[in-house]
Amino acid sequence: AYRPSETLCGGELVDTLQFVCGDRGFYFSRPASRVSRRSRGIVEECCFRSCDLALLETYCATPAKSERDVSTPPTVLPDNFPRYPVGKFFQYDTWKQSTQRLRR
């Protein structure tokens, strides 16, 4: 089980999302669902609260092939969506370390 206090912020969060989601890409926010009235957003959830791999997966843009429900429309991105250097300087070791931290 992961440590409840584990958090990921800033570039480390973005890099780890890129690693987890791969070619699927990711969003910073999700549409509100029946269980959650309001979408908190990945920054609030993972940086300020706590984070695990399952939570990170929910922010991937397209559901993994193993998932059956593919009916959810893609999230509408906020106006201030990333100017992060997405995809540049792939750092496998760094991302691997971050995901391993979340698995502990």
Partner: antibody, heavy 120, light 107 residues
């Protein structure tokens, strides 16, 4: 015009308390992570604390953890920093800053700063 | 915490000079590096974010480059209004840390 305006600084004795305010205008305050950054006289910049847009969650530098509390009132477009158990090393100019959360976590808007002096 | 260092700590230059400031991180931060300019008695102003993206309204004589642990800020042709202190800041992980600054003064 996008603007941040701090107030509440002053001279306080060691062990004392002070509450800083930062009034925001010109942008949708409730949508952004906000932060406090300080600068001791003649020294560099130090991140102090951040708060999520909703105000529900916070982060602190180890140097102020347990003594400082960041909060916000989105209805008033105002950010706060409650500083307790102040020490001489807390003497600094305190800036409030807007965090470009989706663009690399740079601080793209800063206030003019408010001076806090902790001395007996 | 990630430690940031800058070199030189101070330098003197003349209007028209090409100036380069280096920032180093204690561990790889990809390109999550921001540059700020601060003039005496004023708040810092962001010049570049994500290592090389010029902030809106910042003159094109400023440029940034680098990745992983080594970054540079370059001013291609120094102008009178450029004399100030420059800080780098990593935004890879909390606590977001700043470099100690580089003071650029007139020769």
């Amino acid at each position: 015009e996008v603007q941040l305006l701090e107030s509440g600084g002053g001279l306080v004795q060691p062990g004392g308390s002070l509450r800083l305010s930062c009034a925001a205008s010109g942008f949708t305050f409730s949508e952004y992570v906000m932060a406090w950054v300080r600068q001791a006289p003649g020294k560099g910049l130090e991140w102090v604390s951040s708060i999520v847009s909703s105000g529900g969650y916070t982060k602190y530098a180890d140097s102020v953890k347990g003594r400082f509390t960041i909060s916000r009132d989105n209805s008033k477009n105002t950010l706060y920093l409650q500083m307790n158990s102040l020490r001489a090393e807390d003497t600094a100019v305190y800036y409030c800053a807007k965090d470009m959360t989706y663009s690399g976590d740079a601080f793209d808007v800063w206030g003019q700063g408010t001076m806090v002096t902790v001395s007996s | 915490d990630i430690q940031m260092t800058q070199s030189p700590s101070s330098l003197s230059a003349s209007v028209g000079d090409r100036v380069t400031i280096t920032c180093r991180a204690s561990q790889s931060i990809n390109t999550y590096l921001n540059w700020y300019q601060q003039k005496p008695g004023k708040a810092p102003k962001v010049l570049i974010h994500a290592a090389s993206t010029l902030e809106s309204g910042v003159p094109s004589r400023f440029s940034g480059s680098g990745s992983a642990t080594e970054f540079t800020l370059t001013i291609s042709s120094l102008q009178p209004e450029d004399f100030a202190t420059f800080y780098c800041q990593q935004s890879y992980s909390v606590p977001f840390t700043f470099g100690p600054g580089t003071r650029l003064s007139s020769k």
